[in-house]
């Protein structure tokens, strides 16, 4: 038996007073830029590498991790001024005598070509065209990253119109 038109009308009116769940969406927070499966935030101020690391943590994110040359190129394409550079999440581990990402993995020899010294207290920054090492105490801008997250958008059906 089909429901009466009147009943259907009442159901719709009742639902309008509730929120309705849309399908799950992949969203970046406001001010963050989406780059494939990541959200990136480019700082406006400068800090030593350690403070940059801490700032990203307070934003529930990390300093940028770069997986390959393609991701490096995509990120560098977002740097619109060749006169500005940004810290990333890579520094020199004296104990292991190797470049180490902040997630604990080591730099593969063919990932990034770093210009500069591999020595104690060296951290890595990127510019529009290059990747450099520098004293970690140097004050520079930095890039935080978040993985793209599922956001359940709760909206009123009226706003769909």
């Amino acid at each position: 038996q089909k429901p009466s038109i009147g009943k259907c009308s009442v159901d719709i009116q009742q639902n309008r007073t509730k929120t309705t769940e849309r399908p799950d969406l992949l969203n970046c927070p406001i001010y963050w830029q989406q780059v494939q499966e990541k959200c990136l935030l480019f700082s406006h101020t400068v800090n030593p590498w350690n403070n940059s690391l801490a700032d990203c943590s307070t934003k529930e994110s990390s300093l940028l991790l770069i997986q390959d040359k393609d991701e490096l190129t995509r990120t560098q394409n977002l740097i619109h001024d060749k006169a500005i550079s940004f810290w990333i999440g890579l520094n020199f581990s004296l104990s292991e005598k190797n470049w180490k990402w902040i997630n604990g993995s080591f730099l593969s020899s063919n990932d990034l070509k770093i210009t500069g010294d591999a020595k104690e207290n060296s951290c890595v920054y990127i510019s529009q065209t290059s990747v450099y090492s520098e004293y970690c105490s140097t004050e520079m801008k930095w890039i935080c990253q978040k993985e793209l997250t599922l956001v359940r958008n709760k909206v009123s059906p009226d706003s769909w119109l």
Epitope: S85, G116, E139
Partner: antibody, heavy 122, light 108 residues
């Protein structure tokens, strides 16, 4: 507009003191490494000192170490150079200079003031 | 300290000429070198940094090359406003940041 303006130069006797100031405008001063660079009359350029954006890191040329003190006030967009125990060889035009942001402590000077003349003479 | 030696100390040239100035470092500085132009009574102006990067707003007739200890500034076609003194500067990440002695480009 984007500019640096030095002041505080003048004539001072050997052993005397002088404080130079540099007023920055048109850019986010607190993001930049700043330096003082000098040029003796008819001579070349000599870097004197730099200070990091927060003021946490400072360096001096050997020729002024222990006599000159660099400082900054980011709230006032100002850079300073306190010069004590001045000598005749400190006579020069003193320039305030901003460093290119792209290269960390590899300092390239992309914005200069017009300079202020310091003359040390008895 | 790293010393920079510029040559020649002066050069006479005409408008339209190609002018080359060299800068030699006393030890290797990778590509950490800049070139500046200074006119009488004026502050220096950054032309080239990181040995070959053209500073924003600088005409493309200026170019830089080199790495290690030997560097070159080239003006491909000299213009009237290019008559000035040119300085190189090394920018290794430890001070002092030394300058070359300068090269004066004069009208022939």
């Amino acid at each position: 507009q984007v500019q640096l303006v030095e002041s505080g130069g003048g004539l001072v006797k050997p052993g005397g003191s002088l404080r130079l100031s540099c007023a920055a405008s048109g850019f986010t001063f607190a993001n930049y490494y700043m330096s003082w660079i000098r040029q003796a009359p008819g001579k070349g350029l000599e870097w004197v000192s730099y200070i990091s954006p927060s003021g946490a890191t400072i360096a001096y040329a050997d020729s002024v170490k222990g006599r000159f003190t660099i400082s900054r006030d980011n709230a006032k967009n100002s850079l300073y150079l306190q010069m004590n125990s001045l000598r005749a060889e400190d006579t020069a035009v003193y320039y305030c200079a901003r460093s290119l942001m792209a290269t960390g402590t590899h300092l390239y000077f992309d914005l200069w003031g017009r300079g202020t003349l310091v003359t040390v003479s008895s | 300290d790293i010393q920079l030696t510029q040559s020649p100390s002066s050069v006479s040239a005409s408008v339209g000429d190609r002018v080359t100035i060299t800068c030699r470092a006393s030890s290797g500085i990778s590509s950490w070198l800049a070139w500046y132009q200074q006119k009488p009574g004026k502050a220096p102006k950054l032309l080239i940094y990181a040995a070959s990067e053209l500073q924003s707003g600088v005409p493309s007739r200026f170019s830089g090359s080199g790495s290690g200890t030997d560097f070159t500034l080239t003006i491909s076609s000299l213009q009237p406003e290019d008559f000035a003194t040119y300085y190189c500067q090394q920018a290794t990440s430890f001070p002092p940041y030394t300058f070359g002695g300068g090269t004066k480009v004069e009208i022939k």
